[in-house]
C-alpha cells in the first residue's frame, strides 16, 4: 500500500472521521431549513461541499474507485454520496438555466445520515429487503384491484354522471343548449339540484332502489363526474383509482354513498366484498410480509 492509501484507510476507520461527517450532515440539514439564508451561508455551503468531497476522496483512495469487489462505487450507499457531490458542483459551477430544479437534489444530503448512522442503515436495509419480498404480494394486490376495477367498470360506468335536473325548461332551451351556456357554479345551481353545502349536484339513479330526485327535478345523465371529475368508474384507470381508494379506506364512505345513490343499494355487496378482501385481507398480508422481513433482518 502506498503511504497515501495507508493514511486514507487510517482516516476512514477513525471514529472522529465518522463523527465529523455526521455533524456536517446535521449542520447542513439545519442550514437547508433556513427560509431566507444570509449571504455568508454561501461560504458555509462551499465548506460542506468541500467536506463531502474530502470524504469521498478518502474513501476512493482507501478502497479504490470502481475496479474490484469492495471499491467505492460497488457500495450502493456511496452512489448517494457521489450524486450529492456531482449535483453540488453542477449547481454551483455550470449554468443550466433552471437551477432551482437541480437545487432540489440538495435534499439528498439529508439521506447521507442513513449511511453514517449504523442502526438506521440496518432498518433501511430491512425496508429494502421487505420491498423485494413484497413483489409477490404486490402482484396479487394489483391483480385483485384490476379484477374488481373491471367489475366496477361494468357495473357503474357513467352512473356517477346522473344528476337531478330542473323540470321547468324555458320554451327553446334544450339540455345541450343549457350545458353549452353553463359556466359558473351559480349557473349550474340554477338547473341542477344541490344539497346545502354540497359542491356537486345531487346524484340520482334510474333503478327503484337508487336515489330519487326531489319534486320538480328529474334524473338525467349529463355533465362531469363528482369531485371535479376525479371520482368515477368511466375508464379502467379511474375505476382502479376508486378501488385503490377503497383498499386504503381513503374517504371511502363518500365513494360508497355516491355509488349506491347512483346505482342502487343492492350494489353494497360489491363494496362489502372489496372492503373485506382489499382492505382487511390484502393490507394485512402486506403488513405481515413487512413484519417477516424485519424479523429475518434482525436475526
Amino acid at each position: 500500500f502506498s503511504p497515501l492509501r495507508r493514511i486514507s484507510i487510517k482516516i476512514l476507520v477513525h471514529s472522529l472521521f465518522s463523527m465529523l461527517i455526521m455533524c456536517t450532515i446535521l449542520t447542513n440539514c439545519i442550514f437547508m431549513t433556513m427560509n431566507n439564508p444570509p449571504d455568508w451561508t454561501k461560504n458555509v455551503e462551499y465548506t460542506f461541499t468541500g467536506i463531502y468531497t474530502f470524504e469521498s476522496l478518502v474513501k476512493i483512495l482507501a478502497r479504490g474507485f470502481c475496479v474490484g469487489e469492495f471499491t467505492f462505487l460497488r457500495d450502493p450507499w456511496n452512489w448517494l454520496d457521489f450524486v450529492v457531490i456531482v449535483f453540488a458542483y453542477l449547481t454551483e459551477f455550470v449554468n443550466l438555466g433552471n437551477v432551482s430544479a437541480l437545487r432540489t437534489f440538495r435534499v439528498l444530503r439529508a439521506l447521507k445520515t442513513i449511511s453514517v448512522i449504523p442502526g438506521l442503515k440496518t432498518i433501511v436495509g430491512a425496508l429494502i429487503q421487505s420491498v423485494k419480498k413484497l413483489s409477490d404480494v404486490m402482484i396479487l394486490t394489483v391483480f385483485c384491484l384490476s379484477v374488481f376495477a373491471l367489475i366496477g367498470l361494468q357495473l357503474f360506468m357513467g352512473n356517477l354522471k346522473h344528476k337531478c335536473f330542473r323540470n321547468s325548461l324555458e320554451n327553446n332551451e334544450t339540455l345541450e343548449s343549457i350545458m353549452n351556456t353553463l359556466e359558473s357554479e351559480e349557473d349550474f345551481r340554477k338547473y341542477f339540484y344541490y344539497l346545502e353545502g354540497s359542491k356537486d349536484a345531487l346524484l340520482c339513479g334510474f333503478s327503484t332502489d337508487s336515489g330519487q330526485c326531489p319534486e320538480g327535478y328529474t334524473c338525467v345523465k349529463i355533465g362531469r363526474n363528482p369531485d371535479y371529475g376525479y371520482t368515477s368508474f368511466d375508464t379502467f384507470s379511474w375505476a382502479f383509482l376508486a378501488l385503490f381508494r377503497l383498499m386504503t379506506q381513503d374517504y371511502w364512505e363518500n365513494l360508497y354513498q355516491q355509488t349506491l345513490r347512483a346505482a342502487g343499494k343492492t350494489y353494497m355487496i360489491f363494496f362489502v366484498v372489496v372492503i373485506f378482501l382489499g382492505s382487511f385481507y390484502l393490507i394485512n398480508l402486506i403488513l405481515a410480509v413487512v413484519a417477516m422481513a424485519y424479523e429475518e433482518q434482525n436475526q
Partner: nanobody
Framework: EVQLVESGGGVVQPGGSLRLSCAAS????????MAWYRQAPGKQRELVAY??????ISYADSVKGRFTISRDGSKRVYLQMNSLRPEDTALYYC???????????????WGQGTLVTVSS
C-alpha cells in the same frame, strides 16, 4: 338511431277533441322527461305540457283544464286535447330527454311535428 314519431294530428272544429300520441322508436335505455311543444304560424315555439318519470306534470296557463298529458309505459306519451280553440292551431312537437344506451349521456330529442288545425 332514436326517433320520436308523433301521430293524431288533423283538422277539428272549435270545441272538438283530439288525441296526439308520441312514441320513441329505436334503442332506448331510459326516457327522463317527455313534453309537448307547439309552434303557431309566425310565432315562437312554446311549451304545452310535460310529464316526468316520477309523475310530475306541468301545463302552460293557456291549456290548463283543457289538455291532459299522460304517459303509457316508458316509451310513449299522449296529449288529450279537449275544448279546442282556433288559437290552438299549430304544429305540435314531441320532445324527450332520453338516454339511448347506458353509456351515452342524456340528450334532447325532437319529433318532426304533427299539424293540428282548429277551424269551423
Amino acid at each position: 338511431e332514436v326517433q320520436l314519431v308523433e301521430s293524431g294530428g288533423g283538422v277539428v272544429q272549435p270545441g272538438g277533441s283530439l288525441r296526439l300520441s308520441c312514441a320513441a322508436s329505436g334503442p332506448v335505455f331510459n326516457i327522463n322527461r317527455m313534453a309537448w311543444y307547439r309552434q303557431a304560424p309566425g310565432k315562437q315555439r312554446e311549451l304545452v305540457a310535460y310529464v316526468t318519470p316520477t309523475g310530475d306534470i306541468s301545463y302552460a296557463d293557456s291549456v290548463k283544464g283543457r289538455f291532459t298529458i299522460s304517459r303509457d309505459g316508458s316509451k310513449r306519451v299522449y296529449l288529450q286535447m279537449n275544448s279546442l280553440r282556433p288559437e290552438d292551431t299549430a304544429l305540435y312537437y314531441c320532445r324527450a330527454l332520453l338516454q339511448p344506451d347506458r353509456y351515452s349521456n342524456t340528450r334532447t330529442y325532437w319529433g318532426q311535428g304533427t299539424l293540428v288545425t282548429v277551424s269551423s
